[in-house]
Amino acid sequence: LEVSESPGSVQVARGQTAVLPCAFSTSAALLNLNVIWMVIPLSNANQPEQVILYQGGQMFDGALRFHGRVGFTGTMPATNVSIFINNTQLSDTGTYQCLVNNLPDRGGRNIGVTGLTVLVPPSAPQCQIQGSQDLGSDVILLCSSEEGIPRPTYLWEKLDNTLKLPPTATQDQVQGTVTIRNISALSSGLYQCVASNAIGTSTCLLDLQVISPQPRSV
């Protein structure tokens, strides 16, 4: 018995269906086929869980969280023992193993390993201003999404016809910050932060109002 090499990893957007491949070749009839799918969750590597089991011509549910979401892609018994997982959740991310036995066929590699990564688009980011908005001050524009896998990058733009940040601004696309030094009236206006990753984007807008000192009455 020999389990074929798997592609290594599968990526899927949260809520979509993941197909985890596993196929084998055997010299024996599929009368005593036994297939166990296990997962080592990324969030808890010390707690492997059973995903689904095929034994004695019957299918059995694995861990409770997979109930109603998992099944074999084809009619069993078969040499293709790939599974699907519907409505994928972040907690489904992990290393999946298919363990195949088909007595009396022994020897060979009977385990296939596939990684599953559930991707999450950036959630609506929060735009905030840190620091005094008084003329001549330094301010930091902050942007961050609570969710996003892979981790989002952040791009700030000023929503005027140049789409450029003020000349005194420096941007950190990883942290999601823009530092504007010595703010002037020209720094005032509407700024857009775009949070983006491999599967999506999300934005927030920020209104920067530079406060000019009131002329003192004599």
Partner: antibody, heavy 123, light 110 residues
């Protein structure tokens, strides 16, 4: 409560420049946080955002119209204006001025709006 | 062609509940908030619902908004004759870096 009122010619010849003015009353156009906008509505169709101006003079235009649009502000008169060059029959529409503000939102809204003025492009 | 898609017309009888849908994409409704405007005959649009589901002061609680995925909807319960108007959805589009509207839905009260 801020009110807006559009004014300008209702008929413009093709290839000429459409010019409209919006007068703001009940508040100052120089109030921070308000972006003075133009929006148009083609006959029997949806709305299209044209662009905005901030009291400082900073402008931002719809990329699809950017090459033909100029928005300006006159804070002393509490007015802002729209110029749309090289007009064709496709620019026939009701033109609205509106105030956009962010409020506590992530993306803001348009409120209030002027009554709108119909501009027909025809020879 | 409007960026956001609305049905051109909707209708209902007084007292009924009607919903108006607004369909967009991941770059607008999918990732940004939605506003709704009411345009009574011969008047300018008026803000009806802001930020997906917030009613500005003065808007009756018969009007409500919701958003799911890349679609939004406006619900009107206890339909009244004065609700006969055009309704527009609006969102911000991250790809266009600008504000986009639906084509409008004409609501008729039968």
């Amino acid at each position: 409560q801020v009110q807006l009122q559009e004014s300008g010619p209702g008929l413009v010849k093709p290839s000429q420049t459409l010019s409209l003015t919006c007068t703001v009353s009940g508040g100052s156009i120089s109030s921070g946080g308000y972006y003075w906008s133009w929006i148009r509505q083609h006959p029997g169709k949806g709305l299209e955002w044209i662009g905005y101006i901030y009291y400082s003079g900073s402008t931002y235009y719809n990329p699809s119209l950017k090459s033909r649009v100029t928005i300006s502000v006159d804070t002393s008169k509490n007015q802002f204006s729209l110029k749309l060059s090289s007009v064709t029959a496709a620019d026939t529409a009701v033109y609205y001025c509106a105030s956009w503000s962010l409020g506590t939102s992530n993306h803001g809204w348009f409120d209030p709006w002027g009554q709108g003025t119909l501009v027909t492009v025809s020879s | 062609q409007s960026v956001l898609t609305q049905p051109p017309s909707a209708s209902g009888t007084p007292g009924q509940r009607v919903t108006i849908s607004c369909s967009g994409s991941s770059s607008n409704i999918g990732s940004n908030t939605v506003n709704w405007y009411q345009q009574l005959p011969g008047t300018a649009p008026k803000l009806l619902i802001s930020d997906n589901n917030n009613r500005p002061s003065g808007v009756p609680d018969r009007f409500s908004g919701s958003k799911s995925g890349t679609s939004a909807s406006l619900a009107i319960t206890g339909l009244q004759a004065e609700d006969e108007a055009d309704y527009y959805c609006q969102s911000y589009d991250s790809n266009l870096s600008g504000w986009v509207f639906g084509g409008g839905t004409k609501l008729t009260v039968l």
